[in-house]
């Protein structure tokens, strides 16, 4: 019962997490204009992985997609890749875990097969969550770097009383959604792996043992009439799984500018 609950809860938590990763990836608020030095702005800028937007105080919002692929910063491309890999792995994991659920009977699927699938989906969720956390963290790091770079030359004098305030960007809502969602997917994956251990069937094998009585060459087999002593070996044969899933996303150099409109 506890195993079913753990597996079910792991599935639900992962489902919520993957939905969150998808939401975060699609959101436009990955970076939002920092209003600390300009709280009176009537024009608010925010940017996502796929487009940048400007919301005017009048209520009008204009969004423009990044219609170039090669012209975008390498880090942004890396973040996109990590999030997409996370979504794909998570989606496959969800598909596998549906069939692995103990409460769902599909034909004459054995518990060992369900245990295998549960572990596979668990590993997929763990990697999916890590991809999302890594993607969001890389973007956050990029923001922090650019924030301090733009702070260094915040005000560039234009002569006399004229000044140009450089737009700085800070963490957007999508980053927090991504971190939480990645964490949930990771937790869900761990729960699935834990559930897998309880799902693995306990196989009891009695191995034949020969007893040689002095002066006789009679072989006695355990379980028989003459030798009912329990000398058989009760081994719990637990399968050892190879959970060696790896992601090989290359870490690329920082872009010189975050404002990639």
């Amino acid at each position: 019962m506890a195993v079913t609950a753990c597996q079910g809860l792991g599935f639900v938590v992962s489902l919520i997490g993957i939905a969150g990763i998808i939401a975060a990836t699609c959101m436009d608020q990955w970076s939002t204009q920092d209003l600390y030095n300009n709280p009176v702005t009537a024009v608010f800028n925010y940017q996502g992985l796929w487009r940048s937007c400007v919301r005017e105080s009048s209520g009008f919002t204009e969004c423009r997609g990044y219609f170039t692929l090669l012209g975008l910063p390498a880090m942004l491309q890396a973040v996109r890749a990590l999030m997409i890999v996370g979504i794909v792995l998570g989606a496959i994991g969800l598909l596998v875990s549906i069939f692995a659920l103990k409460c769902i009977r599909i034909g004459s699927m054995e518990d060992s097969a369900k245990a295998n699938m549960t572990l596979t989906s668990g590993i997929m969720f763990i990697v999916s969550g890590l991809c999302a956390i890594a993607g969001v963290s890389v973007f956050a790091n990029m923001l922090v770097t650019n924030f301090w770079m733009s702070t260094a030359n915040m005000y560039t004098g234009m002569g006399g009383m004229v000044q140009t305030v450089q737009t700085r960007y800070t963490f957007g809502a999508a980053l927090f959604v991504g971190w939480v969602a990645g964490g949930l997917t990771l937790i869900g994956g761990v729960m699935m792996c834990i559930a897998c251990r309880g799902l693995a069937p306990e196989e009891t094998n009695y191995k034949a043992v020969s007893y040689h009585a002095s002066g006789h060459s009679v072989a006695y087999k355990p379980g028989g009439f003459k030798a009912s002593t329990g000398f058989g070996s009760n081994t719990k044969n637990k399968k050892i799984y190879d959970g060696g899933a790896r992601t090989e996303d290359e870490v690329q150099s920082y872009p010189s500018k975050h404002d990639y409109v």
Partner: antibody, heavy 118, light 113 residues
């Protein structure tokens, strides 16, 4: 056709309060911010503040905080501006104007002349 | 607050002439997010409310004759009337729409000889 119809001229005594109305028609009232602008005896224009009719959220020019209060009545698609503790300096033409792209004001009321005199 | 400075304060021209008027802001009105300048031009004829001519520094409002052209970026902006007509007699105001409070220039009064 879009219209912003303002209330008629007002003559008030110093210290009194006045409420100017701006009735809109021809467009979705809650979809556009409403701004109020002051023009003293044919001189330049001063932005008083604006209101988002959908949420009722207001933004004021610091100079007019405490002087002007902006409200809306969604049911009648009307915006209001109340001016309190009137002095002769408040004598001016007051306009309501709708926000548009670029935060520009595309439609203006005909103006309400306020005269403060004892 | 952003200070808007207009020049000249008034100018007199003959019909058909080309006219340019300047507007300078104390701070850049260029938004990096969409590369648009948040400056607006209005025309106010005597006894009338202002009328929107140009927004985003160079985008002409629908119904505005194409003799009116807005240009400039950052802090320096210009309104050009390619061939002045008698009906263009008015005061022209520029406005900062980039940050609160929205501020207007003191106006340029255009008079026809």
């Amino acid at each position: 056709e879009f219209q912003l119809q303002q209330s008629g001229p007002e003559l008030e005594k110093p210290g009194a309060s006045v409420r100017i109305s701006c009735k809109t028609s021809g467009y979705s009232f809650t979809g556009y911010n409403m701004n109020w602008v002051k023009q003293s005896n044919g001189e330049s224009l001063e932005w008083i503040g604006n209101i988002d009719p959908y949420y009722g959220a207001t933004r004021y020019n610091q100079k007019f905080k405490g002087k002007a209060t902006l409200t809306v009545d969604k049911s009648s698609s009307t915006a209001y501006m109340q001016l309190k503790s009137l002095t002769s300096e408040d004598s001016a033409v007051y306009y309501c104007a709708r926000s548009y792209y670029g935060n520009a004001f595309d439609y203006w009321g005909q103006g309400t002349t306020l005269t403060v005199s004892s | 607050d952003i200070v808007m400075t207009q020049s000249p304060s008034s100018l007199t021209v003959t019909a058909g002439e080309k006219v340019t008027m300047s507007c300078k802001s104390s701070q850049s009105l260029l938004n990096s997010g969409n590369q648009k300048n948040y400056l607006t031009w209005y025309q106010q004829k005597p006894g009338q409310p202002p009328k929107l001519l140009i927004y985003w520094a160079s985008t002409r409002e629908s119904g505005v004759p194409d003799r009116f052209t807005g240009s400039g970026s950052g802090t320096d902006f210009t309104l050009t009337i390619s061939s002045v007509q008698a009906e263009d007699l008015a005061v022209y105001y520029c406005q900062n729409d980039y940050s609160f409070p929205f501020t207007f220039g003191s106006g340029t009064k255009l008079e026809i000889k």
